[in-house]
Interface confidence: low
């Protein structure tokens, strides 16, 4: 065979967002008949020569970026896309609110606001989430997620997380759920887009606001000063699609 072997896939089951002390399985999948799998934790000099890593109880130290590859004979495959394994419940849950309120008319505007007492500069908004632990806070910080021209697709249950760009894989517990009700329409609600930006997307403006726009299951993230929050290709997450928005505050 000429050229490198094709890359395997790496996924986290049931999810790459894992509450502390909860189980998760990382699975590297290549073609049939692989001689050897190698699963590595990036930035830690650690790897194992097994395709499956079962973590019975998630720890902070296990959060981070993983990738895998495989060997057939003397040939190594290209590495898989990176998988970002996030420990949630490391910090207290933020609060999530809707302005002016959680009930909004189709075509109207609504802003989802995530607030935390920690000095976090990163926030993630989900249309569905996982529960996890708490911690004591210090100062108020917040992120605004304006949704312009609301449609029925925006109906659903939202949660947000907060975290620091210094420890991008250690997240708060999810906020309590916020049910967003869009009135005056009968269109079936849809899920959030499946290709989110990286959770470590950085914004150069400390007070930048994130605008979330939906158009046929495609969304963009841009600030009110037109700063684009697009992750570098090499940092893009792999595995099951993670349905969230992120913003730097």
């Amino acid at each position: 065979q000429s050229g490198p072997l094709p890359k395997p896939s790496l996924q986290a089951l049931p999810s790459s967002l894992v509450p502390l002390e909860k189980p998760v399985t990382l699975r590297c999948q290549g073609p049939p008949g692989v001689d050897l799998y190698r699963l590595e934790k990036l930035s830690s000099s650690r790897y194992q020569d097994q395709a499956v890593l079962f973590i019975p109880a998630m720890k902070r130290s296990l959060a981070g970026r993983y990738r895998c590859s495989y060997q057939n004979g003397s040939l190594w495959s290209l590495p898989s896309d990176q998988l970002e394994l996030v420990a949630t419940g490391v910090f207290a849950k933020p609060s999530l609110s809707a302005q002016p309120g959680p009930a909004v008319s189709s075509g109207g505007d609504v802003t989802l606001q995530c607030q935390t007492r920690y000095g976090f500069d990163q926030f993630a908004l989900y249309k569905e989430g996982d529960p996890a632990p708490y911690k004591n806070p210090e100062r108020w910080y917040r992120a605004s997620f304006p949704i312009i021209t609301v449609t029925a697709a925006h109906s659903g249950t939202y949660r947000c997380y907060s975290f620091s760009s210094r420890d991008p894989y250690l997240w708060s517990a999810p906020s309590d759920p916020l049910e967003l009700v869009v009135t005056g329409t009968s269109v079936t609600p849809s899920r959030l887009p499946t290709e989110p930006p990286s959770p470590v997307a950085e914004f150069s403006e400390a007070t930048a606001e994130l605008t979330v726009s939906f158009t046929n299951e495609v969304f963009t993230t841009e600030t009110s000063r037109s700063i684009t929050a697009s992750p570098k290709e090499s940092d893009s997450p792999a595995g099951p699609a993670r349905q969230y928005y992120t913003k730097g505050n």
Partner: antibody, heavy 125, light 107 residues
Framework: VQLQQSGAELARPGASVKLSCVAS????????VNWMKQRTGQGLEWIGE????????YYNEKFKGKATLTADKSSSTAYMQLSSLTSEDSAVYFC???????????????????WGQGTLVTVSA | DIQMTQSPSSLSASLGERISLTCRAS??????LNWFQQKPDGTFKRLIY???SLDSGVPKRFSGSRSGSDYSLTISSLESEDFADYYC?????????FGGGTKLEIK
Amino acid sequence: VQLQQSGAELARPGASVKLSCVASGYTFTDYYVNWMKQRTGQGLEWIGEIYPGSGNTYYNEKFKGKATLTADKSSSTAYMQLSSLTSEDSAVYFCATWRGNLYYDYDAETLFAYWGQGTLVTVSA
Amino acid sequence: DIQMTQSPSSLSASLGERISLTCRASQDISNYLNWFQQKPDGTFKRLIYATSSLDSGVPKRFSGSRSGSDYSLTISSLESEDFADYYCLQYASYPYTFGGGTKLEIK
């Protein structure tokens, strides 16, 4: 599980020594081997570790350039070479082990559960 | 690096006495702490792992606990074979670091 370390070493300043730690009673390639330093009357310092299954190593920054960890799977033996010896390297060196995969690095149940008996290294002109 | 401050550095106690040794962590180590015994012949034995779990074969007079950043090893009733050196180890982050040790001597 047993870890049998090599005998005492007497070395000149500037020389190198290679200590061994022979493992038995378990699958050698499934366990990390760690090395520690204990100077007379002082505490313990962690030098680094090797995962024999892959040859992957991880060092304490303080010992980078001083210690080199290797492993021979065929003989289930881990080695630590100490180079450019000085009197500061005079100490007892221990190997210890625990089960290694990306979860078990952090699994306390096997962490440093088994130790070698130690090897005394004396550096003297 | 995480510093582990162990106290006392030495302790004289009598048979049957209850004693406690403490290690204070300079940063949060989230219960990632082991206790070891080093006998006079230099051999090491792990007593406690993950702050409070007793190793198999270790007598139940040994116990481990935590209060904030202080981690303690308690021996409820000293026996002659307990007189040795004791060390704590944190494995929350690299490099792993040990406490300075406690020499437990018979009074």
